[in-house]
């Protein structure tokens, strides 16, 4: 079932929520206003004295001894205890035991490039999206999702991996960015802040949202994630901003209601299958797209990012649950798990709709639009 649409004519205006009926007074929060920030984020967006752990965009692949075409995923490395809050975007260190898994965290030393040189690349994510400067590409057609409405069985693994909450997706979820650009969904996870501090990774004209969902996909041209890493278009992530609305989102509640079971770092639970598409905005035709990277080590580039124009709305109670329930390493809350925005370095963000033409709720003075580069190829 499709989610209701709101303000679909305004870039990043209006969200969708899982229910049409408002709840009682107790459950109807006022909306929060996301902060405006510079890149990198301002002081308010950095973890505080108790720096909090972050998350990994990419699930690890099974060892090569396993079935070659398997899309089963292992969890990411655990994170270090939090430390200095000043540079949340590029921090990590090697596992002292010397295995392949890197222990990294948001905030503190050493910088992420020491864990993965790609983190110092020129085309990194997340980025600040400026609708006025986006290139309108009519060839960017509505996204196509197939098989995202999962039955209750088999159940799915929901895990607190110390830097995010991650839902592992079964085979069969197909997504197309356009003709010949086909992908399979692997996992989804969230980024969030804390009450009073927004935590989306991408920003819009410096405006950070309360949270962000990422659905990570592997190109059908590759059998394994490690083969796709760093390859242009090898991975694709669908991203949507989460903001506060006046109703409980019933789709998200199916996951949020289970977070207490996985409060402890490294814990996991099984949840019934659900409609994964209901976690995303209803408007698949209006989005921004650019080529970037994973937002955590290994920070591999070549990732196609699709950021929905429409937002998804959760109630304040649900956002509180998301940011207050989980714990990371070192007895620290799992919060503020986002990377600072990275420079575009000449990249042009494309839009599937005329985002720069007097339609943005945060529109600046009119700017000459960039020309469409991709033409939907």
């Amino acid at each position: 079932q499709r989610l209701p649409r709101m303000q679909e004519d305004s870039p990043l205006g209006g969200g969708s929520s899982g229910e049409d009926d408002p709840l009682g007074e107790e459950d109807l929060p006022s909306e929060e206003d996301s902060p405006r920030e510079e890149d990198p984020p301002g002081e308010e967006d950095l973890p505080g004295e108790e720096d909090l752990p972050g998350e990994e965009d990419l699930p690890e692949v099974k060892p090569k001894s396993e079935e070659e075409g398997s899309l089963k995923l292992e969890d990411l490395p655990t994170v270090e205890a939090p430390g200095d809050p000043q540079e949340p975007q590029n921090n990590a260190h090697r596992d002292k035991e010397g295995d392949d898994q890197s222990h990294w965290r948001y905030g503190g030393d050493p910088p992420w490039p020491r864990v993965s040189p790609a983190c110092a690349g020129r085309f990194q994510s997340p980025v600040d999206i400026r609708p006025q400067l986006a290139a309108f590409c009519p060839a960017l057609r509505p996204l196509e999702l197939l098989g995202f409405q999962l039955p209750p069985l088999p159940e799915l693994r929901l895990r607190n991996n110390g830097h995010s909450v991650q839902l592992t997706l079964p085979p069969g979820l197909e997504m197309a960015l356009g003709p010949g650009r086909e992908y399979r969904a692997l996992q989804l996870h969230l980024h969030w802040g804390a009450a009073g501090r927004p935590g989306s990774e991408h920003t819009v004209e410096g405006h950070r949202f309360p949270a962000e969902i990422h659905v990570v996909h592997l190109s059908t041209a590759f059998a394994r994630v490690d083969e796709a890493l760093g390859r242009p278009g090898g991975l694709a992530v669908l991203a949507a901003f989460l903001e506060e609305g006046p109703e409980e989102n019933s789709a998200y509640e199916q996951l949020l209601s289970r977070l207490e079971e996985i409060a402890e770092e490294g814990s996991e639970t099984q949840v019934p299958g659900l409609d994964i598409s209901a976690l995303l905005p209803s408007d698949f035709s209006r989005y921004f797209q650019y080529e970037g990277s994973l937002t955590t080590p290994p920070c591999a580039q070549g990732v196609i990012w699709t950021v929905f124009n429409q937002t998804v709305m959760l109630s304040a109670k649900q956002l509180h649950t998301l940011s207050d329930t989980l714990w990371g390493p070192g007895d620290s809350r799992l919060q503020l798990n986002f990377r600072a925005t990275q420079p575009l370095n000449g990249r042009v963000i494309e839009a599937s709709f005329p985002a720069g033409v007097d339609s943005s709720p945060r529109a600046a003075e009119p700017v000459q639009l960039n020309s469409c580069l991709a033409a939907g190829d």
Partner: antibody, heavy 119, light 112 residues
Amino acid sequence: ELVQSGAEVKKPGESLKISCKGSGYSFSKYWIGWVRQMPGKGLEWMGIIYPTDSYTRYSPSFQGQVTISADKSISTAYLQWSSLKASDTAMYYCARTHGYYKNGRMDVWGQGTLVTVSS
Amino acid sequence: DIVMTQSPLSLPVTPGEPASISCRSSQSLVHSNGYNYLSWYLQKPGQSPQLLIYLGSNRASGVPDRFSGSGSGTDFTLKISRVEAEDVGVYYCHQYGDFSDTFGQGTKVEIK
């Protein structure tokens, strides 16, 4: 409900800490806001605190003038002054505040604490 | 800070008759999600304020349906369809679209 501490009479330069105790709801999951009402005047928003992690936000008019704190273990929020002035004489209300990032509607109010500062 | 301006500041009313209070903000209170970050409170004599309306037009629980809120952007109105004696007091509009909330000066409603 929110129950505030009793009326206070203080001298200029003295310190003061008034309290607001919540019950009947999950205290740590809502912001607590503080509102001042000077005699015969309107409402002024002072600031808010999120009891879960004691994150605070102040009105620019009150930043540095007062300190808002909370102890979630006893479901209590506090408003304190290190050095009172006669102009701090007012009724002070605490209010349960909705919202996640932003402040929001205030749907449950304390009965108010009257603070009188006079030499 | 966003400045909230109410009018009138005093409103004599007749029981059974309608009443209307206006509130204007110096900046738009519409959030990107389409909701107006404005609420209305009534402070009866000698009492704490009580929430009447939030998000511009949503009635709080327990509030009689004779109270309604309308408006969007910078102009908002609180209407009482049929004033009752218990409705006397000071009415405040309150914006929470900025990081620092502000209230209107208040409108004193009294029976003629």
